[in-house]
């Protein structure tokens, strides 16, 4: 369970994959839809809004204990709207939705390096954000070796 | 309850080698970065090694990078420090601490052992 | 890397004054701060993380603030068991450091 409805702290980052390519967002049609690409050297890189929240991890053992703290977060481009994990389709979409937000809008926090992080679904674990055609799409890692799979690592920048 | 207890301490000579050890209970080991750090005899503290929680990364500030090793064995729930070339400089209690979180190394190192003793002299 | 600079190194208080001490980073960076304190002979114990965080356990006379480069640990009522070392850590970005430390005795 999520301790809280405030997070702990919140981070206005730029997003890059692993390989130094920027996740944008474009509204196009009244919906915003995310890139991934390359931009020109003094191109603006687009913000995300990274809302961390403490989740308490129930103990694998017999009892109510709890066995260790997870840090979640939320990613926001743009007011009202936030990424989501569609299990169905494996695929991150942006919704606009309003608070409290959806399970599906939740993604485990990993250091895979010390400057690299992978986000995990909250509601299907093993499932990471991935890049996979120039697109944000849903990635089942089967294996702990995996983890470090460079599609699914990403850079976070104030800058 | 979580527990971390350090282990290989002692008097060794400049150039020589130690092995230090953490026996670590009371939680899922393999969910959690683990790092060592030292504190030179009334000094402040400095991060000497980290882990990943899945073994593959590891890090060092460029005092000891070259010469300590950290490592871990997940099913002995346990973190080493492999010391080589050692200096005076290096001198130290050393503390193995894991990280507030699963997955992450955010949020400090609520988790200390009591700290080994590592002296280099002649 | 980023320096953390504490201050002051020391400092005399009396029990139930109001203690405050800073970490000035050389560098701006995200709220990764934490604080600990030390007795002698023992070892650091965790107070505040993400920079205004309170461990659990910690007294809630102990408080964190800040962002960017300046950070703040503040004691509201001095207790007899405060007296000890104070260290501030960075955790944003490799290599991890630390401040040099705030010592806090009895006047």
């Known amino acids: 369970s999520i301790t809280g409805i405030s997070p702990i702290t919140e981070y206005l980052a730029s997003l890059s994959t692993y390989n130094d390519q920027s996740i944008t967002f474009a509204l196009e049609d009244e919906s915003y839809e995310i890139y991934v690409e390359d931009l020109k050297k003094d191109e603006k890189k687009d913000k995300v809004l990274l809302s961390y929240y403490e989740s308490q991890h129930p103990s694998n053992e017999s009892g109510d204990g709890v066995d260790g703290k997870m840090l979640m977060v939320t990613l926001s481009p743009t007011k009202d709207f936030w990424l989501h994990a569609n299990n169905k389709e494996h695929s991150v979409e942006l919704h606009k939705c309003e608070k409290p937000l959806p399970d599906q809008a939740f993604f485990v926090l990993h250091n895979m390096h010390s400057n690299c992080v992978s986000f995990e679904c909250k509601t299907d674990p093993g499932v990471f954000i991935g890049v996979k055609d120039n697109h944000l799409a849903l990635i089942k890692v089967d294996s702990s070796e995996n983890l470090c799979t460079e599609n699914i690592l990403f850079k976070l920048s104030e800058t | 309850e979580v527990q971390l207890v350090e282990s290989g301490g002692g008097l060794v000579q400049p150039g020589g080698s130690l092995r230090l050890s953490c026996a670590a209970s009371?939680?899922?080991?393999?969910?959690?970065?683990m790092t060592w750090i030292r504190q030179a005899p009334g000094k402040g503290l400095e991060w000497i090694a980290s882990?990943?929680?899945?073994?593959?990364?590891?890090y060092y500030p460029d005092s000891v990078k070259g010469r300590f090793t950290i490592s871990r064995d997940d099913a002995k729930s346990s973190l080493y420090l492999q010391m080589n070339s050692l200096r005076a400089e290096d001198t130290a209690v050393y503390y193995c601490?894991?990280?507030?979180?699963?997955?992450?190394?955010?949020?400090?190192?609520?988790?200390w052992g009591q700290g080994t003793l590592v002296t280099v002299s002649s | 890397d980023i320096q953390m600079t504490q201050s002051p190194s020391s400092l005399s208080a009396s029990v139930g004054d109001r203690v405050t001490i800073t970490c000035l980073a050389s560098?701006?960076?995200?709220?990764?701060l934490a604080w600990y304190q030390q007795k002698p002979g023992k070892s650091p114990k965790l107070l505040i993380y993400?920079?205004?965080r309170l461990q659990d356990g910690v007294p809630s006379r102990f408080s964190g603030s800040g962002s960017g480069t300046d950070f703040t640990l503040t004691i509201s009522s001095l207790q007899p068991e405060d007296f000890a070392t104070y260290f501030c850590?960075?955790?944003?970005?490799?290599?991890?450091?630390f401040g040099g430390g705030t010592k806090v005795e009895i006047k």
């Open positions: 882990i990943t929680y899945t073994g593959g990364g590891t």
């Open positions: 009371g939680f899922t080991f393999n969910n959690y970065w």
């Open positions: 850590q960075q955790g944003s970005k490799y290599p991890l450091t």
């Open positions: 560098e701006g960076f995200s709220n990764d």
């Open positions: 601490t894991r990280a507030n979180y699963y997955y992450n190394t955010y949020g400090g190192f609520p988790y």
């Open positions: 993400a920079a205004s």
